[in-house]
Amino acid sequence: AGVFELQIHSFGPGPGPGAPRSPCSARLPCRLFFRVCLKPGLSEEAAESPCALGAALSARGPVYTEQPGAPAPDLPLPDGLLQVPFRDAWPGTFSFIIETWREELGDQIGGPAWSLLARVAGRRRLAAGGPWARDIQRAGAWELRFSYRARCEPPAVGTACTRLCRPRSAPSRCGPGLRPCAPLEDECEAPLVCRAGCSPEHGFCEQPGECRCLEGWTGPLCTVPVSTSSCLSPRGPSSATTGCLVPGPGPCDGNPCANGGSCSETPRSFECTCPRGFYGLRCEVSGVTCADGPCFNGGLCVGGADPDSAYICHCPPGFQGSNCEKRVDRCSLQPCRNGGLCLDLGHALRCRCRAGFAGPRCEHDLDDCAGRACANGGTCVEGGGAHRCSCALGFGGRDCRERADPCAARPCAHGGRCYAHFSGLVCACAPGYMGARCEFPVHPDGASALPAAPPGLRPGDPQR
């Protein structure tokens, strides 16, 4: 468990001609806020996959009004870091998406209007516990400068925050240079020594004597910048860990605390210290507030700051769900008539009509197939005074109105049931099986056949 931290340094027009003066105007003051989305080791192109490592929303920045004639300054930014807690191991390689949002403070009906100004994405290698890495990204005419790091939450330590360090002996009992993180009270552990000369800012090691480089640095001692691009890492505030322990068997092994909670042993069992927004014996109960940034895709969070008050996400066009986490497939309502192709542009729907049809929804017939249009992108083919439809993939029937069954290929294994849900096929597994496609048997004692069930596995109840 640990926290990914993002510090935004500046956001403003990039260098070169055609740069925008300001996102705000004298007529329409505005303020900025940021959202970060983290994914483990994916390519940044997978924009629709969920923020599996977590997401966070910044506070609103100070109100800014453009002064006519004045040079464009760096825009005022929100205070503080964006913090994304992660509950499991830090993956080392991760993808990020940073969105810059503008909140206009005019007299709009229904409150402030907000719009996405810029979106940058990247894939990086980062060791937990390392120094701040600095980055510059451009999105269109805008430039974003930021730093980021990942740090472990005690008692987790290491470059992946997977090892537990429990200080059980007084520091005075260990000799010079030794740390009290060993499993027995009378044992002390020597700190990990990297290769001599390994850059403390740009290198790290997981084994004694090695020197592995952070993103943007190379060379045997990680002192050579790969290029003068965006990955330079000057010295910044560093998160020093205090030693590591390969844990022996104990009640905290495997960290029973969910949602980033940290585990400490008690004489009889264990105790979880939960991060803000979670509570319960194992931190399994969520009491999320707006302070936790629960609204995705630029959703605006409304609600009290105290843990007992509910929050509501007001979603931007094109998104829905209690956390704005689901993209609305407005085209699934098939608004385009006569086989028109539906395009969801986010702010509006657009129909691209087949030859022979016109109108905002392709409702006007212009040709001989009039009144006999094929639905869902099918093509009308005339012949011998009759017509037939050549249907698009996924549709069938005389007029292409029948949706082809996504379950026809029987994707749910071991007798599981497949359902044609609008969000895609869904499997309900027969008792004794689990997995998105019911591919994993469940042991009779209730444990899965996997070492740990990946997210999204849905167990059938083996006791039935």
């Epitope: 029948e402 949706r403 069954d405 049931r417 609008f422 309900a428 167990p459 109840d461």
Partner: antibody, heavy 118, light 109 residues
């Protein structure tokens, strides 16, 4: 527009039998759904009776409904519920409903009233 | 499988918050295959929330579902007059079994 319509309800005597029909429009059972029957006695909450899975025709029943109620697929757009040995306690509005994933009923018919009385 | 809803009835002022609880005697399938419905007299139930927390298309965002396993909650923030109705939870269980809760009547004043 996807719709379900129930028919076949009415007055029946105790120990009598009745068959209800659910007719789908705007979609057919060529896709895989649970087509289910749910009843609601006056002033009470809904009560699940049975489902037929259109993917393979398998059926599931509430424990209390086994033996007296039979669900079957009559065509690609109709499902029936045969009810036997009806009692006064079976008086209710009978709904046809569709589960198309995640175990919830996203589409309901308006219901048909079954009255068991002598 | 028995679903118990509390409290009933529940009363709220316009703009207030309503919280309804639903407890299952056993864990629902996948720990989150639980849905919430709103029903008004003479109408079939209408789904509000599916899979414990997902808002059905067209349902106002003031409805929020939460919970997992055996304990679930429906919260209505900023209640409107139109929200006066009876609310039911419904679970889906391993072995393809469905069950409904007993219902909670919500009065908005």
């Amino acid at each position: 527009q996807e719709q379900l319509v129930e028919s076949g309800g009415g007055l029946v005597q105790p120990e009598g039998s009745l068959t209800l029909t659910c007719t789908a429009s705007g979609f057919s059972f060529s896709s895989s759904y649970d087509m289910c029957w749910v009843r609601q006695a006056p002033g009470k909450g809904p009560e699940w009776i049975a489902c037929i899975y259109t993917g393979d025709g398998s059926t599931d029943y509430a424990s209390w409904a086994k033996g007296r109620f039979t669900v079957s697929k009559a065509s690609s757009t109709t499902v029936t519920l045969q009810m036997t040995s009806l009692a006064v306690a079976d008086t209710a509005t009978y709904f046809c409903a569709r589960n198309s994933g995640y175990g919830y009923f996203g589409l309901w018919g308006p219901g048909t009233l079954v009255t068991v009385s002598s | 499988q028995v679903l118990t809803q509390t409290p009933s009835p529940v009363s709220a002022a316009v703009g207030g918050t309503v919280t309804i609880s639903c407890q299952s005697t056993e864990s629902v399938y996948g720990s989150d295959w639980l849905s919430w419905y709103q029903q008004k007299p003479g109408q079939p139930p209408k789904v509000l929330i599916y899979q414990a927390s997902n808002l059905e298309i067209g349902v106002p965002s003031r409805f929020k579902g939460s919970g997992s396993g055996t304990q679930f909650t429906l919260t209505i923030s900023g209640a409107q007059c139109d929200d006066a109705a009876t609310y039911y939870c419904q679970g889906y269980y391993s072995g393809y079994i469905y069950a409904f809760g007993g219902g909670t009547e919500v009065v908005v004043k």
